[in-house]
């Protein structure tokens, strides 16, 4: 990679963090009476995610997690789930390249919506600031 | 068998530059990320820098700047540049395979760099 | 960054005893640790992955556990050839960050 994609890697990794935030923060907001509900559906966590190519674990995921928004009141966010979804989906596709062949490889245990954005933000806050 | 072979150290003088090589063999390479760890004398291990197979590269603030970590996968070789070199960056370099899913699996026997003047 | 602690700077054992060796981590790691031994001169080898696998080749003596911050290096007993220096490791983020070493040594 160059100086300049490296460049458009941190911006899109910083979109993704913005658009992880802006759902956790959607979910967790006080008047989301849909909270409960929300916290029984379980997700899979990567078994690592240390890379670029592990946000093919994310991607994995993203269908459920829109499954999981709909059932949120949509004034806790800016747009539909479904567009949401599809911007961060356009995101990971570009970030973690063209290698088909990777295979997500999931932990034991799954995670609450909760637990599966924190470890995606903490994911994207630590490529952020590594890569180079 | 999976075989990490570092070279490349030497004695510098502070501000100078040296280039570390980790020839490799024994896996297919270009599918793992790879990875710089050093050792102070008398110290613990510290991530120097990664590499992906997407030739992405990944380091701390300590060596961001200074350090630059490559790969040719035709060859396969890692390579450590490092410039603008400090009486703290002294110590044994090693060149370690980070497994896709886990932990760094396995190391060269390292390299010795001294800085000083 | 994540900060690996392990508190025991030096233990000392001897051969046949069971020993556990500790490792704190600053924040939840999940299971992304490994444990790594290394002996004087020697390059570091890797021993534990995912808090509690033992890699290909590595003694039934040596296990671990934990998840989250806590973890041990356990070592059911100990053989005069496990005298050295163990490290843990979390790989649930970059920057990689390492404890800084537990040596056993004899009593």
């Known amino acids: 990679p160059t100086s300049s994609s490296t460049k458009k890697t941190q911006l899109q990794l910083e979109h993704l963090l913005l658009d992880l935030q802006m759902i956790l923060n959607g979910i967790n907001n006080y008047k989301n009476p849909k909270l409960t509900r929300m916290l029984t559906f379980k997700f899979y966590m990567p078994k690592k995610a240390t890379e670029l190519k592990h946000l093919q674990c994310l991607e994995e995921e993203l269908k459920p997690l829109e499954e999981v928004l709909n059932l949120a009141q949509s004034k806790n966010f800016h747009l539909r789930p479904r567009d949401l979804i599809s911007n961060i989906n356009v995101i990971v596709l570009e970030l973690k390249g063209s290698e088909t062949t990777f295979m997500c490889e999931y932990a034991d245990e799954t995670a609450t919506i909760v637990e599966f954005l924190n470890r995606w933000i903490t994911f994207s806050q630590s490529i952020i600031s590594t890569l180079t | 068998e999976v075989q990490l072979v570092e070279s490349g150290g030497g004695l510098v003088q502070p501000g100078g530059s040296l280039r570390l090589s980790c020839a490799a063999s024994g896996f297919t390479f270009s599918s793992y990320t790879l990875a710089w760890v050093r050792q102070a004398p008398g110290k613990g291990l510290e991530w120097v820098a990664a590499?992906?197979?997407?030739?992405?590269?990944y380091s701390p603030d300590t060596v961001r700047g200074r350090f630059t970590i490559s790969r040719d996968n035709a060859k396969n070789s890692l390579y450590l540049q490092m410039n603008s070199l400090r009486a703290e960056d002294t110590a044994v370099y090693y060149c370690?395979?980070?497994?896709?899913?886990?932990?760094?699996?396995?190391w060269g026997q390292g390299t010795t760099v001294t800085v000083s003047s | 960054d994540i900060v690996m602690t392990q508190s025991q700077k030096f233990m000392s054992t001897s051969v046949g005893d069971r020993v556990s060796v500790t490792c704190k981590a600053s924040q939840n790691v999940g299971t992304n640790v490994g444990w790594y031994q290394q002996k004087p001169g020697q390059s570091p080898k890797a021993l534990i992955y995912s808090a509690s696998f033992r890699y290909s080749g590595v003694p039934s003596r040596f296990s671990g556990s934990g998840s989250g911050t806590d973890f041990t290096l356990t070592i059911s007993s100990l053989q005069p050839e496990d005298f050295a220096t163990y490290y843990c490791q979390q790989y649930y983020t970059y920057p990689y960050t390492f404890g800084g070493g537990t040596k056993l040594e004899i009593k």
């Open positions: 590499i992906d197979s997407s030739s992405y590269t």
């Open positions: 370690a395979r980070d497994s896709n899913w886990d932990a760094l699996d396995y």
